[in-house]
């Protein structure tokens, strides 16, 4: 799915009223020392593509992310204001059904949702401007 | 817990240059950006600048741009803010701040730095 | 680059009043907008981000409204410690303009 069409600044309120608080309920009890941002995105699109990416997509030591309350509602966001984004999601959603997984907050989930913290902190920046 | 400490009053003389630093802890430093913003005696705020310590990358308001250097150390946590040809109007208190978990605000200060220029 | 205008500049007021400063940017800046509350020889302590979120640890007597390019601050019941000088900021675009302060004064 290209990002390029959202409504960013709808999204970026989405996060900053609700989903960034389930993101730290989270990681409570979580050191924030503990680790280091090592994704990264260039631009909203892009920081949208990998958000999607960590979010949805499981990974080997943690694989039951979408399940979580701040997934949901990235993908409510997403759906509302992402033109078109909810069509392609159709799929994946019911691939997504047949391979659901008991809840486990692993040590690799928790770095995982620490690096989904770091692209929407990109996401969330003012536009940096060279002056 | 988050701290940023700053380096102490400094007394200068017009067109010298001065090298305030910024020592961060109880975060990763690399993954927020610092912001430097100053305050002259009984004036409001004035953004100076950002820096990106990961990347060293860094956005300086216009009104500083060619006198203003941030750096950071990776190494030692700390950022740095070098001003140079300072002038009388220079005088004031200098602030670092850390970026926000969400990247849309900056919620840890530093607790100032006195800068005064005078002859 | 984007001006902040706020006002008023100064604000006389009893503890138990309910009071309002309002801040105008001089485009749209959507809800990038994050209020601080500043007292004499100390650092500014964030309040609101996003215009209408409001920080951690901060009272509820607090709360930040407004998008576009007109936003405000309420406190709905002054305490004593509210009296300080409170700064907006954009967060829309580098460079993040503040806006003038208002003064917020024991009547």
């Known amino acids: 799915y290209d990002f390029t069409n959202c409504d960013f600044e709808k999204i970026k309120a989405a996060y900053l009223s609700t989903i960034s608080k389930d993101l730290i309920t989270y990681m409570s009890g979580t050191k924030s020392t503990e680790f280091n941002n090592t994704v990264s995105c260039s631009n909203r699109p892009h920081c949208l593509t990998e958000i999607q990416s960590l979010t949805f997509n499981p990974t080997a030591g943690c694989a039951s992310l979408a399940k979580e309350m701040f997934a949901m509602k990235t993908k409510a966001a997403l759906a509302i204001w992402c033109p078109g984004y909810s069509e392609t999601q159709i799929n994946a959603t019911q691939a997504m059904k047949k391979r659901r997984k008991r809840k486990v907050t692993t040590n690799k989930c928790l770095e995982q949702v620490s690096q989904l913290q770091g692209l929407w902190r990109r996401f969330n920046r003012p536009l940096l401007k060279q002056q | 817990q988050v701290q940023l400490v700053q380096s102490g009053a400094e007394v200068k003389k017009p067109g010298a240059s001065v090298k305030v630093s910024c020592k961060a802890s109880?975060?990763?430093?690399?993954?927020?950006?610092i912001e430097w913003v100053r305050q002259a005696p009984g004036q409001g705020l004035e953004w100076m600048g950002i820096?990106?310590?990961?990347?060293?990358?860094?956005y300086y308001a216009q009104k500083f741009q060619g006198r203003v250097t941030m750096t950071a150390d990776k190494s030692t946590s700390t950022a740095y803010m070098e001003l140079s040809s300072l002038r009388s109007e220079d005088s004031a208190v200098y602030f670092c701040?850390?970026?926000?978990?969400?990247?849309?605000?900056?919620?840890?200060w530093g607790q100032g730095t006195t800068l005064t220029v005078s002859s | 680059d984007i001006q902040m205008t706020q006002s008023p500049s100064s604000l006389s007021a009893s503890v138990g009043d309910r009071v309002t400063i309002t801040c105008r940017a001089s485009?749209?800046?959507?809800?990038?907008l994050v209020w601080y509350q500043q007292k004499p020889g100390k650092a500014p302590q964030l309040l609101v981000y996003?215009?209408?979120n409001l920080q951690s640890g901060v009272p509820s007597r607090f709360s930040g409204s407004g998008s576009g390019t007109q936003f405000s601050l309420t406190i709905s019941s002054l305490q004593p410690e509210d009296f300080a000088t409170y700064y907006c900021?954009?967060?829309?675009?580098?460079?993040?303009?503040f806006g003038t302060g208002t003064k917020l004064e024991i009547k």
């Open positions: 701040a850390k970026e926000s978990l969400t990247g849309s605000s900056y919620d840890y």
């Open positions: 109880g975060y990763a430093f690399t993954n927020y950006l």
């Open positions: 820096i990106n310590p990961e990347s060293g990358d860094t």
């Open positions: 485009e749209n800046i959507y809800s990038n």
């Open positions: 996003g215009a209408r």
């Open positions: 900021q954009h967060f829309y675009e580098t460079p993040l303009t």
